[in-house]
């Protein structure tokens, strides 16, 4: 928001006047002509001295009268050369020319800075015919001038394919200073110098600048526009504005807040979006960024088990999208999780810690020492194993899944058995004789089925063969054990 003082406020005598030899007024200038109103021109300057030849374009008509007297050259009459007035005032100026009556359809057009003025402009042309000539007065009026009305105005008339151009009328609209550049809000590093810029223009010129910081003037004497203020550094937020002064008064820029960059506030509302056996998806609401964009965040995870060694796992991630999946966690474990984020100044404090738990997972290892042997008397295959280590069960064991595949003469059949968690042995009926039985076992929790053990193969002979020895899980390196009985 720009505050404007009254025009009359002139705190500094800046310069004597905008143009050498020119006058100034706040009255509406009106050009008086013989057929116009009785007002005297309040502020008008003729570009030529009396008696000096006209400088505009002149058309010399070739037509002669009955007495064969050549007609005088056609030219616009001298008029005001320069009008100075205040913004929002009214102005009226005109061009006049006397045209012999032999010419028909004479029209006058108005031009500003080389462009024809068409449409919604207050231009009036009046004709005053006499015996031999018609006086034409073209008036142009602006009811409330703005800065955009500044410029050079001319009249043009076409006669006999000749163009007659008047001398220019310069309109100068004066007002309070107008900002072309105002200070901008900034976020700055504490105790570090920075610059602010302020620029304002008239007319009238010159425009002088005062800087204000937290209601105190920084410079007690004005500086010519444009002005750059070097602020030597701040320790706390400050508000800056600049005042632009000219002969018409002063305009005050918007006040801008300069903030001091600081470490961010800690994130809030850390919450669990999803838990699996080995990962937890968390989200958080970032704290205040300290007037400096977040760069990245750090997720700190520690086991909540009082018997744990208290070590903290740290996961770094980008600041967006305020979401992170923590991986490589143990199943069925409790964790404390905190989040901290950083900007260019430093790290925030850690968010309030939250408790989170991983779910049961499928065991991560297979049962150990799987042994298979044939009990020929009962026509069964006996299987034995050792349960996987508790740490790697990833949940409460609910049983085992046994896969046994029977292969004989191009026929293959897989069967699955489920057994309870108490035992560590199972018995399965022989399905096919003179065949190979391949056995694999997996531990089962509510979280799912773990990996199957390496396959153990046993050959089941035709009836009457003897079971000499068991088959067992191979030692590492023997990929495909087979025991022929």
């Amino acid at each position: 928001a720009i505050t404007e003082a009254r025009e009359e406020a002139k705190p500094y005598p800046l310069f004597p006047g905008p143009f050498p030899g020119s006058l100034q007024t706040d009255h509406t200038p009106l050009l008086s002509l013989p057929h116009a109103s009785g007002y005297q021109p309040a502020l008008m300057f003729s570009p030529t001295q009396p008696g000096r030849p006209h400088t505009g374009n002149v058309a010399i008509p070739q037509v002669t009268s009955v007495e064969s007297k050549p007609l005088p050259p056609l030219a616009f009459k001298h008029t005001v050369g320069h009008i100075i007035l205040s913004e929002h005032k009214g102005v009226k100026f005109n061009c006049s020319i006397s045209v012999p009556n032999i010419y028909q359809d004479t029209t006058i057009s108005w031009w500003k800075d080389g462009k024809e003025l068409l449409g919604a402009h207050h231009a009036i042309t009046q004709f005053y015919p006499d015996d031999e000539v018609t006086a034409i007065i073209a008036s142009f009026s602006i009811t409330s001038v703005q800065r955009s009305d500044n410029g050079s105005y001319i009249c043009k008339m076409k006669i006999n394919n000749e163009e007659i151009v008047s001398d220019p009328i310069y309109i100068e609209v004066q007002g309070l200073p107008h900002f072309t550049k105002q200070p901008e809000s900034m976020n700055v590093t504490r105790n570090t110098a920075f610059n602010l810029t302020c620029q304002a223009v008239g007319p009238p010129e010159p425009v002088n600048i005062f800087w204000v910081q937290n209601s105190s003037r920084v410079n007690e004497q004005p500086e010519k526009s444009p002005s750059v203020l070097t602020v030597p550094g701040l320790t706390e937020m400050a508000v800056f504005s600049c005042e632009a002064h000219n002969d018409k008064g002063l305009t005050v820029s918007k006040g801008v807040q300069i903030n001091i960059k600081a470490i961010p506030s800690p994130p809030t509302e850390v919450s669990i979006r999803n838990s699996t056996a080995h990962s937890i998806l968390i989200s958080w609401v970032p704290g205040f960024d300290g007037y400096s964009p977040f760069r990245n965040c750090s997720i700190q995870v520690k086991e909540a088990d009082p018997l744990s060694n208290g070590s903290v796992m740290i996961f770094n991630t980008s600041a967006l999208p305020h979401l992170y999946q923590i991986k490589q966690l143990q199943a069925l474990a409790n964790y404390s999780i905190g989040v901290s984020c950083m900007n260019e100044i430093g790290w925030s404090a850690v968010s309030p810690w939250i408790l989170a738990s991983t779910t049961e997972g499928a065991p991560s290892v297979a049962p150990l020492n799987v042994t298979v042997f044939l009990n020929e008397s009962s026509d069964n295959v006996d299987i034995r194993w050792m349960k996987p280590p508790t740490k790697q069960q990833d949940g409460e064991l609910v049983g085992y899944r046994i896969s046994h595949v029977w292969q004989s003469a191009g026929i293959s059949k897989e069967l699955l058995e489920e057994v309870g968690q108490n035992g560590s042995r199972a018995r399965i009926s022989v399905q096919v004789h003179n065949a190979t039985c391949t056995v694999r076992i997996a531990a089962v929790t509510r979280g799912g089925v773990g990996p199957f053990s390496d396959p153990v193969k046993i050959f089941i002979p035709a009836h009457g063969w003897v079971d000499y020895a068991p088959s067992s899980t191979p030692a590492p390196g023997n990929a495909d054990p087979v025991l022929i009985i």
Epitope: Y12, N191, S216, E220, Q221, P222, T230, G233, T235
Partner: antibody, heavy 118, light 106 residues
Framework: QIQLVQSGSELKKPGASVKVSCKAS????????MNWVKQAPGQGLKWMGW????????TYADDFKGRFVFSLDTSVSTAYLQISSLKAEDTAVYFC???????????WGQGTLVTVSS | EIVLTQSPDFQSVTPKEKVTITCRAS?????MHWYQQKPDQSPKPWIK???NLASGVPSRFSGSGSGTDFTLTINSLEAEDAATYYC?????????FGQGTKLEIK
């Protein structure tokens, strides 16, 4: 380079007047205000006020209203301090100093000792 | 008006020692300037706007502070630092100076 050169020491009787000058060089005189600072013997610095070298408008600190006048002659880039009805407690060194942004006194005159003694 | 109180008024210090001069304002100010004055000389601009060393001031000097409490620190005192130091506030008229702190070399 910027310099402020002050007039020489003055010995005055009580009730008399004195005018101290401060001639500036090396910069545009009307760009920076001129401050006046008093330092009584063995005492600290006391700001007396300043004069706007652009408009000639003086501003006086409360303790220096009345007998003290700041003036200018911009044609010779000189600021003046005039003290009338001198008193013994006016005995001091008077400094002129330029008025920069944030009231930073970047340049100082060498000081003028005014002694008031009967 | 804002009253500036410097402490100590006087300090006798051995070379290489660290020196801290404080300037406390009776109410909050935006910036504090510091000046150094030696006997029979005019004050010299020393630290501008709380923490900016003036041209030619040795880097062993530093300034800090905000609000009402400001300090001038000399990290390792040298003989040439013997002088009186004045603080001066900007932010509220009239401008005021502290009463000065005189540093003497032992």
């Amino acid at each position: 380079q910027i310099q402020l050169v002050q007039s020489g020491s003055e010995l005055k009787k009580p009730g008399a007047s004195v005018k101290v000058s401060c001639k500036a060089s090396g910069y545009t005189f009307t760009n920076y205000g001129m401050n006046w600072v008093k330092q009584a013997p063995g005492q600290g610095l006391k700001w007396m006020g300043w004069i706007n070298t652009y408009t000639g408008e003086p501003t006086y600190a409360d303790d220096f209203k009345g007998r003290f006048v700041f003036s200018l002659d911009t044609s010779v880039s000189t600021a003046y301090l005039q003290i009338s009805s001198l008193k013994a407690e006016d005995t001091a060194v008077y400094f002129c100093a330029t008025y920069g942004h944030y009231a930073w006194f970047a340049y100082w005159g060498q000081g003028t000792l005014v002694t008031v003694s009967s | 008006e804002i009253v500036l109180t410097q402490s100590p008024d006087f300090q006798s210090v051995t070379p290489k020692e660290k020196v801290t001069i404080t300037c406390r304002a009776s109410s909050s100010v935006s910036y504090m300037h510091w000046y150094q004055q030696k006997p029979d000389q005019s004050p010299k601009p020393w630290i501008k706007a709380t923490s900016n060393l003036a041209s030619g001031v040795p880097s062993r000097f530093s300034g800090s502070g905000s609000g009402t409490d400001f300090t001038l620190t000399i990290n390792s005192l040298e003989a040439e630092d013997a002088a009186t130091y004045y603080c001066q506030q900007w932010g509220t008229k009239p401008l005021t100076f502290g009463q000065g702190t005189k540093l003497e070399i032992k």
